[in-house]
Structures are given as C-alpha cells and as structure tokens.
C-alpha cells in the first residue's frame, strides 16, 4: 500500500448506537491539509459514509447532517460514527489523503468491522 | 522553485551498467517519496521504482520488469536520487525521468543501450 | 497487480469540444488516480490527483472524476494547446502501473 494507515480490527457499537474508533496515519512529510473519508464495504460494495477535510493543528469539520464526528491530535483521527443499527453492520475503512502542500499522498486502512447490536424493546409494564 | 535535473544518459551497450542520478531543490526532498518512471520511444510511460523516505525506513519498491536489475538510492544529505542499472537490455532505452511522488518531475535523460 | 485500462487510445475532437477519456481499474483503487498530460519532447505533468483533484496551475478546463474502478478525466471545451497524450496511473500501491495513454489530436 502507499501510506500506511491503521485502526482497529473490531469495535463494538454502544447500545445507543455509537462506535468510536482511532485512524492513525504514518505521514511522509508535513502536511498542512488532511482529507479523512470513512467508507463503508459491505458484499463488495463501497460507499462513503462521511468525510472531513482539515488544517493540521484545526478541528475536523463534518457536514451539519453527517453521522460522523471527530477530533484530531498530530497523524492521529478520533472518530465517532453515531445512529447506527443493526443493519449497519459491516467493514468501516478509513481513507485518509495528504492534500497539501503536494505532492499527494493516500492510505487506505484495512478496516473496522463495527457490530451494531439493537436493543431490545423495553418490555410493557402492567 | 521546484527542480529536479537528472544526469547519467548516454549509450550504453547490451549486458553494461549505467548510473543515473537526480538533484532536486526547492522543496524539503526527505519529506517525499521518489521515483523513477521512463518513457520508451513509441510507448507510454512505465513506473520503474520508488524509495520512500526515512518515516518509512527507506522502503524500496519496484516494477518486474526492472526488479533484481536496478536498485534505487538516496542520499538526503545531498538532495539526490539515483537508479543503478545493471544487466541492460536493449528494450530499456528510453527517456529516464525522476519525479518527487509523481508531482514534480524533471526534465529527462536518454539512456541509449545499443551494440 | 492492479491493471489500468484506458480508453480511447486516440481521440480527434474540435476546438470547443468536450472531450473525455476514462480509465478502468481491476480492482477498487478507492480514488488512488492521477491523470498527466504529456507533450511531446517535454516532461509528464500532474493534470488532476486523487481522481477529483485539480492540481496547481492546471486549468479549469480540466476536471476528475469517479471513485471504484472508474475514473473520468474532462476537458470541458477543448484548445489548440490540449493537443497531448494523456495518461491515467494507479496511486494507492505498487506498482504504480499507468494506462497505456490516449493521444489527443485536433480536427
């Protein structure tokens, strides 16, 4: 692979539906612009969750509606997927890009198999 | 400004060695990964080898086929990549180009292996 | 070995057109393309990065696409100075094979 990227092999989510996990990258250089992209590969199909770009040093910015949240340290990404059932269950990779200054760089992580466990309903009390 | 000017070209026969080398400036050179790519007259171009840097413990990659032939280097102190080519065939004329992860490139060095 | 398809080999167009040549991966390259323009007797140089992205300097002319095996690369209205071979190359691994390259020719 190019640039190595490493996370968890298994995170469990909460009863609430929330899974965190860390994306640590090894980078060449200094970069001052990182992309990170959470993917989604389920029965050999990818799609993409959620995706941040930020300025080292400066806080990930996900969009207003996105599930994901996440917090930054040096080449290490703190990330938090929220409103997640049962049927999400799967491979979570995390993609992470050097953007800036070039040249490019890009690492693919070998993913996080996240459970989701839905709770089971409160039963009726007489 | 960014440069990277590579030297070494020339003829070489059939079975020779040959050494090329790359200079570069105007960016931090140890905080990329270089490479070598070439160009065959009437083909298109064809990655040859990479080096990381030392984050990566100066990994070495490379295509078959040049694998076993060629050895890439660096050398920091210096701002300099080389490619040592060994057991030359006469299918590895081309054009030599050095490129700084495929962002910056230089300008080329012929490298003819003729009897 | 990720192998690159690219496609057409050749292509003539009329200044003012849209033009696009695409690239085929064997396998997801998870937006790991770079696409170059070469000139003759000149160096390649970095047209887009990451499937998507324009590199610096380069027109707006130009633009990516595509994410998984397929990849795109747009020249919105095409100039006398396009005239090139353009190349497509696979950036995530080793090796960092380029598709064989498509010959732009104006009409």
């Known amino acids: 692979k190019a640039m190595h990227v490493a996370q968890p092999a298994v995170v469990l989510a909460s009863s609430r539906g929330i899974a965190s996990f860390v994306c640590e990258y090894a980078s060449p250089g200094k970069a001052t612009e990182v992309r990170v992209t959470v993917l989604r590969q389920a029965d050999s199909q990818v799609t993409e969750v959620c995706a941040a770009t930020y300025m080292m040093g400066n806080e990930l910015t996900f969009l207003d509606d996105s599930i994901c949240t996440g917090t930054s340290s040096g080449n290490q990404v703190n990330l938090t997927i929220q409103g997640l059932r049962a049927m999400d269950t799967g491979l979570y990779i995390c993609k992470v890009e050097l953007m800036y200054p070039p040249p490019y760089y890009l690492g693919i992580g070998n993913g996080t198999q996240i459970y989701v466990i839905d709770p089971e309903p409160c039963p009726d009390s007489d | 400004e960014v440069q990277l000017v590579e030297s070494g070209g020339g003829l070489v026969q059939p079975g020779g060695s040959s050494r090329l080398s790359c200079a570069a400036s105007?960016?931090?050179?140890?905080?990329?990964?270089m490479n070598w790519v070439r160009q065959a007259p009437g083909k298109g171009l064809e990655w040859l080898a990479q080096?990381?840097?030392?984050?990566?413990?100066?990994?070495?990659y490379y295509s078959a086929s040049v694998k076993g032939r060629f050895t890439i280097s660096r050398d920091d102190s210096k701002n300099s990549v080389y490619l040592q080519m060994n057991s030359l065939k006469t299918e590895d004329t081309g054009v030599y180009y050095c490129?700084?992860?495929?962002?910056?490139w230089g300008q080329g060095t012929l490298v003819t292996v003729s009897s | 070995d990720i192998q690159m398809t690219q496609s057409p080999s050749s292509l003539s167009a009329s200044v003012g057109d849209r033009v696009t040549i695409t690239c085929r991966t064997s396998?997801?390259?998870?937006?790991?393309l770079n696409w170059y323009q070469r000139k003759p007797g000149k160096s390649p140089k970095l047209l887009i990065y990451?499937?998507?992205n324009l590199a610096s300097g380069v027109s707006s002319r130009f633009s990516g696409s595509g994410s998984g095996t397929d990849y795109t690369l747009t020249i919105s209205s095409l100039q006398p100075e396009d005239v090139a071979t353009y190349y497509c190359?696979?950036?995530?691994?080793?090796?960092?094979?380029f598709g064989s390259g498509t010959k732009l020719e104006i009409k």
């Open positions: 490129t700084a992860q495929f962002a910056y």
């Open positions: 105007g960016f931090t050179f140890s905080d990329n990964w």
């Open positions: 080096i990381r840097n030392k984050p990566y413990n100066y990994e070495t």
């Open positions: 396998e997801n390259i998870y937006g790991g």
């Open positions: 990451g499937a998507t």
């Open positions: 190359q696979n950036v995530l691994r080793s090796p960092f094979t």
